[in-house]
Interface confidence: low
């Protein structure tokens, strides 16, 4: 047993264009209240299906009257937590619906009028006893910020509230096989109360009322020894008389998932992965429309106005699946450059950059060229955490401070002679060649093999390399 607790932080206009109009006015003052509905597992989400884990209604918030002309603010909230007690084990995975209701306080006949302002829904994994989880959900132009947690009620402890704690019988230590109950170190884990009659030697339980058998024993109370010799039938019920253990049907045998759902075994039962348009424990619920809010994690629902037409969920960054129910490992795309460490924070990717790099994806070299002047008209080029200068002709060295001999690299082809010049170098080509670097042979008929010599230049004339 335990309690699911929900703390609403704010309800107001969300980011993005088109701020909603205030739901209250001077003529119609109003106040808010909230309803939460919880369901076990990740499968069923329809607002109409029962809140199998429980539901709760908040107190009414303070009365709010809109100031004329003012934008819709974050609205005043009710005090306190919404608490949903649960009697059995906490399921670990759950679906929630949180509704924001408006109570109009005008002089309506028959008392105040209620109307639903916004509904948000989601599926989450949550261990009991863990810290508050914080969430933001958007419904149209409204944004709801809230935190939630599940906590066990004594004597239950553990992530599912199935382990029990009892005060120590002896001050020094717990009984055989029983651990102290963290964080209540002065208490001891109590043995679970198994099904009545469950063999204390051959049976055990992980949940109250259960009786699971150790290897070699069978029967509802684990009192029947298993004989492996007289088993004839390959599959069927175990025979209590012969003590023959025959494997029972597997949870996925006969595929319990309807409508083309695929079945996978879980430690306790099975799980159906449903095709688009179906949901429920066995994919038995059909006719999902966008009105049912089938897209999770802020997915946008398109189409599906009537039960016969399919809907499509357009998922926000970081989520995928036909209902945006699966988180994408966006770091697997290695978005951080220059050896940056990728962190997927859910709402965003963050790159932790190595020294010398910055930017959202560590794409910028830091300070490579800052304060670095390249002399004599050179330009600074960033790269690899170190700067280098691309020097103007006639200059070289790390900062372009050294005079370079432009002819040192022997740039004139085909025996051309190189002359240093204030604006670069000049090649005097050997007979039969032309071009800035004497790179083009001149055909015997005087035509060049490649671009014609510019007007005023004859083959063999010195050509200045600009």
């Amino acid at each position: 047993a335990g309690v699911f607790e929900l703390q609403i932080h704010s309800f107001g206009p969300g980011p993005g264009p088109g701020a909603p109009r205030s739901p209250c006015s001077a003529r119609l003052p109003c106040r808010l209240f909230f309803r939460v509905c919880l369901k076990p597992g990740l499968s069923e989400e329809a607002a109409e299906s029962p809140c199998a884990l429980g539901a709760a209604l908040s107190a009414r918030g303070p009365v709010y009257t809109e100031q004329p002309g003012a934008p819709a603010p974050d609205l005043p909230l009710p005090d306190g937590l919404l608490q949903v007690p649960f009697r059995d084990a906490w399921p670990g995975t759950f679906s929630f619906i949180i509704e924001t209701w408006r109570e109009e306080l005008g002089d309506q006949i028959g008392g105040p009028a209620w109307s639903l302002l916004a509904r948000v829904a989601g599926r989450r994994r949550l261990a009991a006893g863990g810290p508050w989880a914080r969430d933001i959900q958007r419904a149209g132009a409204w944004e709801l910020r809230f935190s939630y947690r599940a906590r066990c009620e004594p004597p239950a402890v553990g992530t599912a509230c199935t382990r029990l704690c009892r005060p120590r019988s002896a001050p020094s230590r717990c009984g055989p096989g029983l651990r102290p109950c963290a964080p209540l170190e002065d208490e001891c884990e109590a043995p679970l109360v198994c099904r009545a009659g469950c063999s204390p030697e051959h049976g055990f339980c992980e949940q109250p009322g259960e009786c699971r058998c150790l290897e070699g024993w069978t029967g509802p109370l684990c009192t029947v020894p298993v004989s492996t010799s007289s088993c004839l039938s390959p599959r069927g019920p175990s025979s209590a008389t012969t003590g023959c253990l025959v494997p029972g049907p597997g949870p996925c045998d006969g595929n319990p998932c309807a409508n083309g759902g695929s079945c996978s075994e879980t430690p306790r039962s099975f799980e159906c992965t449903c095709p688009r348009g179906f949901y429920g424990l066995r994919c038995e619920v059909s006719g999902v429309t966008c009105a049912d809010g089938p897209c999770f994690n802020g997915g946008l629902c398109v189409g599906g106005a009537d039960p016969d037409s399919a809907y499509i969920c357009h998922c926000p960054p970081g989520f995928q699946g036909s209902n945006c129910e699966k988180r994408v490992d966006r770091c697997s795309l290695q978005p951080c450059r220059n050896g940056g460490l990728c962190l997927d924070l859910g709402h965003a990717l963050r790159c932790r950059c190595r020294a010398g790099f910055a930017g959202p994806r560590c794409e910028h070299d830091l300070d490579d060229c800052a304060g670095r002047a390249c002399a004599n008209g050179g330009t600074c080029v960033e790269g690899g955490g170190a700067h280098r200068c691309s020097c103007a002709l006639g200059f070289g060295g790390r900062d372009c401070r050294e005079r370079a001999d432009p002819c040192a690299a022997r740039p004139c082809a085909h025996g051309g002679r190189c002359y240093a010049h204030f604006s670069g170098l000049v090649c005097a080509c050997a007979p039969g060649y032309m071009g800035a670097r004497c790179e083009f042979p001149v055909h015997p008929d005087g035509a060049s093999a490649l671009p014609a010599a510019p007007p005023g230049l004859r083959p063999g004339d010195p050509q200045r390399y600009l």
């Epitope: 703390q7 206009p13 993005g16 701020a19 819709a72 810290p131 914080r134 709402h347």
Partner: antibody
């Protein structure tokens, strides 16, 4: 770089109003909420409220409800905080600060203005 | 409102000392806590967010820990430039609230 620049010091008489501005630069103005925090001489920090610059939505601390108004002008990336019916105990340095909330993570009030001194005296 | 109580209200320590400041919330705030440093005449500066994450550019001698209701800011080896007032702030529930501050003096 990312910064918040506030308007200059103000001297006001009791009962008057003061309007302090906070101009944002170096980041997407509508992407982060702005909070106002004040500090009376020799005292600790006191949270006044916040504004969502995108929608104009606000949330004010109970103590200042009815006296404070937070607005924004997205065209000039500026947030304003107006405090009315000033009293001598409103004498304080008023700071604007950027809220580093992500959807699942809280980065703190990560960028602060330089502060605006408001003195209320006869 | 959630009350944030810091202790001690002032502390005097020598350069190189290890200094610990605690902050207690009146109710569970999970890890939604930040620590700030404020030097005389200056705006506060974010040191730690989400209880234990070090803000970029803050020296690694600062560290934060805790969750729920009890939190700690530790300066592993005090430096002269650490003379300041340190404040905690909760961001779990509106209104955000600050601790009253701890004034750190150098002996």
């Amino acid at each position: 770089q990312v910064q918040l620049v506030q308007s200059g010091a103000e001297v006001k008489k009791p009962g008057a109003s003061v309007k302090v501005s906070c101009k944002a630069s170096g980041y997407t103005f509508t992407g982060y909420s702005i909070h106002w925090v004040r500090q009376a001489p020799g005292q600790g920090l006191e949270w006044m409220g916040w504004i969502n610059p995108n929608s104009g939505g606000t949330f004010y601390a109970q103590k200042f409800q009815g006296r404070v108004t937070m607005t924004r002008d997205t065209s000039i990336s500026t947030v304003y905080m107006e405090l009315s019916r000033l009293r001598s105990d409103d004498t304080a340095v008023y700071y604007c600060a950027r809220d580093g909330w992500g959807d699942y993570y809280y980065y703190g009030l990560d960028v602060w203005g330089q502060g605006t001194t408001v003195t209320v005296s006869l | 409102d959630i009350q944030m109580t810091q202790s001690p209200s002032s502390v005097s320590a020598s350069v190189g000392d290890r200094v610990t400041i605690t902050c207690r919330a009146s109710q569970d705030i999970s890890s939604w806590l930040a620590w700030y440093q404020q030097k005389p005449g200056k705006a506060p500066k974010l040191l730690i967010y989400t209880a234990s994450s070090l803000q970029g550019g803050v020296p690694s001698r600062f560290s934060g820990s805790g969750s729920g209701t009890d939190f700690t800011l530790t300066i592993s080896s005090l430096q002269p430039e650490d003379l300041a007032t340190y404040s905690c702030q909760q961001a779990n529930v509106f209104p955000y609230t600050f601790g009253q501050g701890t004034k750190l003096e150098i002996k």
